[in-house]
């Protein structure tokens, strides 16, 4: 025997109180798949959350964050404060990157400058709090016999 509820499309629910008739989802609720016995409550974007997409009868609302904050987590489940470039967010707020580290974004952590010498390169441009160093080409690339056409770099082993 086929379940009569399986005929109820997205945007409706199978109403047990009305002989399993397909009823439209009430306001501020939705069903994104057919055959559902209840509609889900729409997400509300409040406070630091901002509505990116309104709720409809077939899809949930989508939130993002107000200016000065950025999304974290699946579906923007949290909003985290932005910092300036050259800073990272700590428990005590935004703090400048320590010497030798940088952050070129408004989010995330300060990362160490690249150590150019590990790849046999030299520093062309010094790093700042907001920018990594720029490593120059390897000395072999600069010698008189250097070819302009560079072969692909060998794949690095994981962890190197």
């Amino acid at each position: 025997l086929q379940d009569p509820c399986s005929n109820c499309p997205a945007g409706t629910f199978c109403d047990n109180n009305r002989n399993q008739i397909c009823s439209p989802c009430p306001p501020n609720s939705f069903s994104s798949a057919g055959g559902q016995r209840t509609c889900d409550i729409c997400r509300q974007c409040k406070g630091v959350f901002r509505t990116r997409k309104e709720c409809s009868s077939t899809s949930n609302a989508e939130c993002d964050c107000t200016p000065g904050f950025h999304c974290l987590g699946a579906g923007c489940s949290m909003c985290e404060q932005d910092c300036k470039q050259g800073q990272e967010l700590t428990k005590k707020g935004c703090k400048d990157c320590c010497f030798g580290t940088f952050n070129d974004q408004k989010r995330g952590i300060c990362r160490p400058w690249t150590n150019c010498s590990l790849d046999g390169k030299s520093v062309l441009v010094n790093g700042t709090k907001e920018r990594d160093v720029v490593c120059g080409p390897s000395p072999a690339d600069l010698s008189p016999g250097a070819s302009s056409v560079t072969p692909p770099a060998p794949a690095r082993e994981p962890g190197h």
């Epitope: 150019c116 441009v125 920018r131 720029v134 390897s138 690339d141």
Partner: nanobody, 116 residues
Framework: QVQLVESGGGLVQAGGSLRLSCAAS????????MAWYRQAPGKQRELVAL???????KYADSVKGRFTIARLNAKNTVNLEMNSLKPEDTAVYTC??????????WGQGTQVTVSS
């Protein structure tokens, strides 16, 4: 590997101007810097100018005040404007894409000859 195609080289009289252009096959923001190098016959390739992702520029002392490097982000292109050219600027000019985590990518180069 990114493809870099240079254009704009040629023969020019001392005191003249040229604009070199380097078109990249991928987003130039993915590189730590874009640069122009030059190499005269029998000499080592030397840095002429570079521009970083945040627009910081660096020039060889010998070209300061005469050459200007600029990015056209929408076109993934880097230009080198060369004014008051001197015979000693004669060289093959090559565009380079510098990525700290990888080997430098080079274009094929374009010849610039400055006659006196």
């Amino acid at each position: 590997q990114v493809q870099l195609v240079e254009s704009g080289g040629g023969l020019v009289q001392a005191g003249g101007s040229l604009r070199l252009s380097c078109a990249a096959s991928e987003n130039i923001f993915s590189f730590n810097a874009m640069a122009w190098y030059r190499q005269a016959p029998g000499k080592q390739r030397e840095l002429v100018a570079l521009i970083t992702g945040d627009g910081t520029t660096k020039y060889a002392d010998s070209v300061k005040g005469r050459f200007t490097i600029a990015r056209l982000n929408a076109k993934n292109t880097v230009n080198l404007e060369m004014n008051s050219l001197k015979p000693e600027d004669t060289a093959v000019y090559t565009c380079a894409a510098l990525r700290n985590s990888d080997r430098t990518s080079w274009g094929q180069g374009t010849q610039v000859t400055v006659s006196s």
